[in-house]
């Protein structure tokens, strides 16, 4: 197949940087993060979308590994579990140094490309992981967090999630609370990518308006193609274009076809739509492999990216457009975020008001002074 051969040629030079992979969650779920369990060997790991041979076959050159803790940990052990998931990513990279290069910058990604390794970055999936604390946010940055998804599928005290737009959650922050605005400003200051997957439309718009740097949707598709509220509506796609931001398309069947079955061609329809509305510079891939129960026919695991690239070439995407979607768009956005950062600027210090802090098992030190 000419197009498949072309896809491989392009990807040898420009491997894919994927915005969201939940292998760390699988390592917790299957092995309680015991990487030395013989079944957890990533060269032979079975029953997952992701392992080392599949990453190699798929020309995956960069991966934001998802550090995720479920919403029921909010106001409980969310921070502990977040640290444990960051730790498993660090240990995974140290255990397979011939495959993974742990990096925290766009320059690091380029270095991994040169070494033929999978640039491995940490994305923290859900604002509840910071427990409404700017100090925790900064600590997670020091430990390698390079994107923060502002919410998962639950509101935080400072940002609203997508289920507000389905009628399944009540709005609390009308997008971003004043503390949520401080979180966005601190993420900008630190040079952390802001991820708007999982957030409400009001939160998307508020953040796109406030952020001094481009943002990403690490694993979201196009609402006009499938009317799931996990997808990005056209008016927001136009804001994505205005802000030079990025939508990394999720492959979950129910967000692709709005049914339990989907195929590779329908994923390409989402990519086409985002390209049409937001421009080729706004397109990326965030497959959500190992984080979803159903993936499209033709995209069964991470080895299948070249088949998707072949389909885009078949649809007359140019080589430059394809390279943009594979890596260049993410690198551009990441570099813009890094350039907008200012670590010499005074950090945000004003804590969340005590009456906005959820949870009953808390002390109130500092608030009484």
């Amino acid at each position: 197949d000419f197009f498949r051969d072309e896809a491989e040629r392009i990807m040898r030079d420009s491997p894919v940087i994927d915005g969201h992979n939940d292998l760390p969650w699988q390592l917790l779920d299957m092995f309680n993060n015991r990487l030395q369990d013989e079944r957890a060997n990533l060269t032979t790991l079975a029953g997952t979308h992701t392992n080392i041979p599949k990453l190699r076959a798929g020309f995956v050159g960069g991966q934001f590994w998802s550090v995720y803790t479920p919403c029921d940990t909010q106001n409980k052990d969310a921070v502990r579990r977040t640290l444990e998931q960051m730790d498993v990513v660090h240990r995974m990279c140290r255990m397979y140094p011939e495959t993974f290069l742990y990096v925290t910058s766009s320059a690091g990604i380029r270095q991994a490309f040169r070494e033929g390794k999978v640039a491995s970055l940490i994305g923290v999936e859900g604002g509840h992981s910071i427990d409404s604390s700017l100090g925790v946010l900064r600590a997670l940055y020091q430990l390698g967090m390079r994107y923060l998804t502002l919410t998962h599928s639950c509101n935080t005290p400072w940002a609203d999630n997508w289920l507000v737009d389905t009628g399944d959650s009540e709005p609390q922050s009308q997008g971003l609370s004043p503390f949520g605005q401080r979180v966005v400003k601190e993420l900008n200051r630190l040079g952390v990518l802001i991820d708007l997957a999982h957030v409400s439309v009001a939160t998307m718009k508020a953040t796109l308006q406030l952020s001094r740097a481009p943002v990403i949707f690490s694993h979201s598709s196009a609402y006009s193609v499938c009317a799931s509220r996990r997808n990005v509506p056209d008016d927001v796609l136009r804001l994505v274009k205005q802000t030079d931001s990025l939508v990394m398309v999720n492959f979950y069947n129910n967000y692709i076809s709005c049914t339990n079955k989907a195929n590779l061609s329908q994923v390409a329809d989402h990519l086409d739509h985002i390209k049409e509305v937001a421009g080729a510079r706004a397109v990326g891939f965030g497959g959500d492999f190992d984080g979803v129960p159903r993936v499209p026919e033709g995209l069964e695991d991470v080895s299948k990216y070249p088949d998707l690239i072949a389909e885009l070439l078949r649809r007359n995407w140019t080589e430059a457009e394809v390279k943009g979607a594979l890596a260049d768009n993410l690198l551009r956005v990441f570099e813009a975020v890094e350039q907008a950062s200012n670590l010499t600027q005074a950090p945000e210090e004003e804590p969340i008001p005590l009456d906005q802090l959820g949870g009953s098992c808390r002390t109130h030190y500092g608030y009484s002074s």
């Epitope: 289920l163 389905t166 009628g167 399944d168 009540e170 009317a227 509220r229 709005c258």
Partner: nanobody, 112 residues
Amino acid sequence: QVQLVESGGGLVQPGGSLRLSCAASGFTFSSYGMTWVRQAPGKGFEWVSTISISGSRTTYAGSVKDRFTISRDNAKNTLYLQMNSLKPEDTAVYYCRNILVQGQGTQVTVSS
């Protein structure tokens, strides 16, 4: 089997009214927010309206505000969309959906 079945569509003149229904089965209807979306010929999906679990919160697209009313009857496992002052640009297939499933749709045509 989780299912949503829309009904009540048809041909109506501009300025006329229709009431769409959506019958739910296979899940606890009263535990989910519900939404109407529509798709005009050759166009993408467009959000129309959403109602919260209890029915206390309703939201509407600007294009239908003050003309359409969403409601639900949790005892009957049914979602409704009352459409008044219909316009030709309201012509579309109307779908009800929640986070679990989307229905097959019902055609609404507004034409004189």
